[in-house]
């Protein structure tokens, strides 16, 4: 079965520059299939733009300005590239690659899509570091004791653009865990988002990872934020203790680590 | 030119209650085309659901049913038992791949229908409220409540900033919420929640500790760390009266 990966979740360009969007085809030989590119502008229908067939023939949708889009494919890397020249804000859109995939039964085909790349056009260059800055929150003791479960929260701040993907995994496991997240929120000229994962007590002694994909991650690789295991011992509980606590009665353990 | 027009821009559905999406074709007979349905979820992933000739995407056959109403010139997609996973934008699209005549292998899309999923009506459930802290950051975690209407207040005299709460459907079909804020006096911040004409405080859920060593990160070396902007700290900590642990990276 054909599978399409678009490694860039977003691509930010300033006006008049050239954008190159990649699509990696697996499970099928790129030289034996056609690759299609679609565009979804905000508030508009998804529209076919251009395709490159197995024999290298390029077909463009009528009404698309000539010279704006270029499509090619590199069999060695099984990649198709959509090049958008002289970008303007009209080009802001999510771009999808797609291909027809034959089903087991003869004559049955479906069109599968890549995950899309959002093209973001800015008037001005970005600041030097607009990658997501993480802060972690570990489960409150109250939750682990009362509910035999614990919630990890991964806060990401001061990133640009707003396109971000977050998922959670246990250490030494590739299984994606069921998590929940808030909307991406604008704070001044950057964005913030948080995601949380609730795990049963038996998993609290395992290390968990909050994995973040963002265009401006250092070296272009996913950022992994490590949540250390939690050791839960026997505890005396008084859930209804509403007396005001002295500020010194609680020690907040905060580990700070900075890296270049 | 043909146009595919969804019946509704937004369709609210309840968990487990069947829902129907309709998409009409303007300018042509729907029988001259193959109809496809796709779902776009958060993060823009476009997943194939259904194509005429009884073709379903992986995992969709049991819970979805595609149909064509030739007389009304429209396509129908039924979600038989919606779950929170079915939230997203649903698109109808057509093509003529494999039909004689003018050969077109491109898809023509209609505008999306946003499907929002709500929990099924159920008895009211009081939330559990917990506070998590890290430096100036405070998170109020509100778990397993119904109905959705809720007011979350982080109580502090020294607020820096607060964010709108995130309210989502919990795996059990109720609601969970998180509200974040930044405060100069984060140690003294508490959370109070107004729900169903009652107030629930995070302090109702706090615990007294006899242990001096019950929350501790494993002592690990800073090696083989793939993260670019965070490193796993080597932690040797003496904890007294710890009721939460946090790590700033």
């Amino acid at each position: 079965a054909g599978h399409l990966e678009q490694p860039q979740i977003s691509s930010t360009k300033t006006l008049s520059k050239t954008a190159r969007l990649e699509c990696v085809v697996s499970g099928i030989t790129i030289s034996a299939t056609s690759v299609y590119w679609y565009r979804e502008r905000p508030g508009e229908v998804i529209q076919f733009l251009v395709s490159i067939s197995y024999d290298g023939t390029v077909r463009k949708e009528s009404g698309i300005p000539s010279g704006k889009f270029e499509v090619d494919r590199i069999p060695e890397t099984s990649t198709s590239t959509l090049t958008i020249h002289n970008v303007e804000k009209q080009d802001i859109a999510t771009y999808y690659c797609a291909l027809w995939e034959a089903q087991q039964e003869l004559g049955k085909k479906i069109k599968v899509f890549g995950p899309g790349t959002k093209l973001i056009i800015t008037d001005k260059q970005l600041d030097a570091d607009v990658s997501p800055k993480p802060t972690i929150f570990l489960p409150s003791i109250a939750e682990t004791k009362l509910q035999k479960a614990g919630t990890y929260l991964c806060l990401l701040e001061k990133f640009f653009p707003d396109v971000i993907k977050i998922h959670w995994q246990e250490k030494k496991s590739n299984t994606i865990l069921g998590s929940q997240e808030g909307n991406t929120m604008k704070t001044n000229d950057t964005y913030m988002k948080f995601s949380w994962l609730t795990v049963p007590e038996k998993s609290l002694d395992k290390e968990h990872r909050c994995i973040v994909r963002h265009e401006n991650n250092k070296n272009g690789v996913d950022q992994e934020i490590i949540f250390p295991p939690i050791k839960t011992d026997v505890i005396t509980m008084d859930p209804k203790d509403n007396c005001s606590k002295d500020a010194n009665d609680t020690l907040l353990l905060q580990l700070t680590n900075t890296s270049a | 030119a043909i146009e595919l027009v969804p019946e509704h821009q937004t369709v609210p559905v309840s968990i487990g209650v069947p829902a129907t999406l309709r998409c009409s074709m303007k300018g042509e007979a729907i029988g001259n085309y193959y109809i496809n349905w796709y779902r776009k979820t958060q993060g823009n992933t476009m997943t194939f659901i259904y194509r005429e000739k009884d073709i379903y995407g992986p995992g969709f056959k049991d819970n979805f049913q595609g149909d064509i109403d030739i007389a009304k010139n429209l396509a129908v997609l039924k979600i038989l038992a919606p779950s929170e996973r079915d939230e997203g934008s649903y698109y109808c699209a057509c093509d003529t791949l494999g039909m004689g005549g003018e050969y077109t292998d491109k898809l023509i899309f209609g505008k999306g229908t946003r499907v929002t999923v709500e929990p099924r009506s159920q008895p009211h459930t009081k939330p559990s409220v917990f506070v998590m802290k890290n430096g100036t950051n405070v998170a109020c975690l509100v778990k397993e409540f119904y109905p959705k209407d809720i007011r979350i207040n982080l109580v502090s005299s020294k607020k820096i900033t607060e964010f709108d709460p995130a309210i989502v459907i919990s795996p059990s079909g109720k609601y969970n919420a998180v509200k974040l804020g930044k405060y100069e006096d984060s140690n003294s911040v508490t959370c109070s929640v107004q729900h169903d004409n009652k107030t629930v405080h995070s302090t109702d859920f706090e615990v007294k500790t006899d242990s001096t060593d019950h929350v501790k990160p494993k002592e690990t070396e800073n090696t083989k760390q793939p993260s670019k902007s965070c490193h796993k700290p080597k932690a040797i900590v003496h904890t007294e009266k710890v009721n939460m642990m946090s790590l700033t990276v």
Epitope: L15, S16, R41, N86, E88, K89, Q90, I92, T122, D123, K124, Q125, L126, D127, A128, D129, F160, N188, D189, T190 | -
Partner: antibody
């Protein structure tokens, strides 16, 4: 509030260099949420954007192709001002020249603060 | 470059009138458009950005609409201080072209 004060000669000879300065008060030329522009206006050409300078971890400039080869816009952080230099002027460059602020870190919403304008005549 | 064409070039109206000025772009510019007001001897003043967002401090009688290639600036009830020249400007692509202007005069 933010104000822009322009200064510079009103008469320039053909083939020489037009130089104007725009002093900023109430904001910083090094702000990472603004850009500093020059715009001119003449009866024959109407309003015409000439370019900008701005700081985002380092200094950047943008110029339209029509003047790119002979224009330079430079910040002066010590005086909190920015300047325009237009080389090899001709009578076609006769216009009212404005400096203007464009707010927004990465996107442009328009020119929200303008200088008072300087009438520059190119004539021998 | 994108051409921005305003119509009419001249417009006579009376205090209290509702007036509409149109701006057409030679190609689609989505909503990347601003409107300015300019009085004789003065610098232009930003009224509206992103096609329809009112700049802070601008009276609510001014409104903007449109997207793609056709845009309008509407003044719901003309005041004496509104007689001026109005310009549109696109921010879709360099070089951020302005319209030629619409001069609004007292009838």
């Amino acid at each position: 509030q933010v104000q822009l004060q322009q200064s510079g000669p009103g008469l320039v000879k053909p083939s020489q260099t037009l130089s104007l300065t725009c002093a900023i008060s109430g904001d910083s030329v090094s702000s990472n949420s603004a850009a500093w522009n020059w715009i001119r206006q003449s009866p024959s050409r109407g309003l015409e954007w000439l370019g900008r300078t701005y700081y985002r971890s380092k200094w950047y400039n943008d110029y339209p192709i029509s003047v790119k080869s002979r224009i330079s816009i430079n910040p002066d952080t010590s005086k909190n001002q920015f300047s325009l230099q237009l080389n090899s002027v001709t009578p076609e460059d006769t216009a009212v020249y404005y400096c203007a602020r464009e707010s927004g870190s990465y996107y442009t919403d328009g020119f929200d603060i303008w200088g008072q304008g300087t009438m520059v005549t190119v004539s021998s | 470059d994108i051409q921005m064409t305003q119509s009419p070039s001249f417009l006579s109206a009376s205090v209290g009138d509702r007036v509409t000025i149109t701006c057409r772009a030679s190609q689609g510019i989505s909503s990347y458009l601003a409107w300015y007001q300019q009085k004789p001897g003065k610098a232009p003043k930003l009224l509206i950005y992103a096609a329809s967002t009112l700049q802070s401090g601008v009276p609510s009688r001014f409104s903007g609409s449109g997207s793609g290639t056709e845009f309008t600036l509407t003044i719901s009830s003309l005041q004496p201080e509104d007689f001026a020249t109005y310009y549109c400007q696109e921010f879709n692509s360099y070089p951020y072209t302005f319209g030629q202007g619409t001069k609004l005069e007292i009838k």
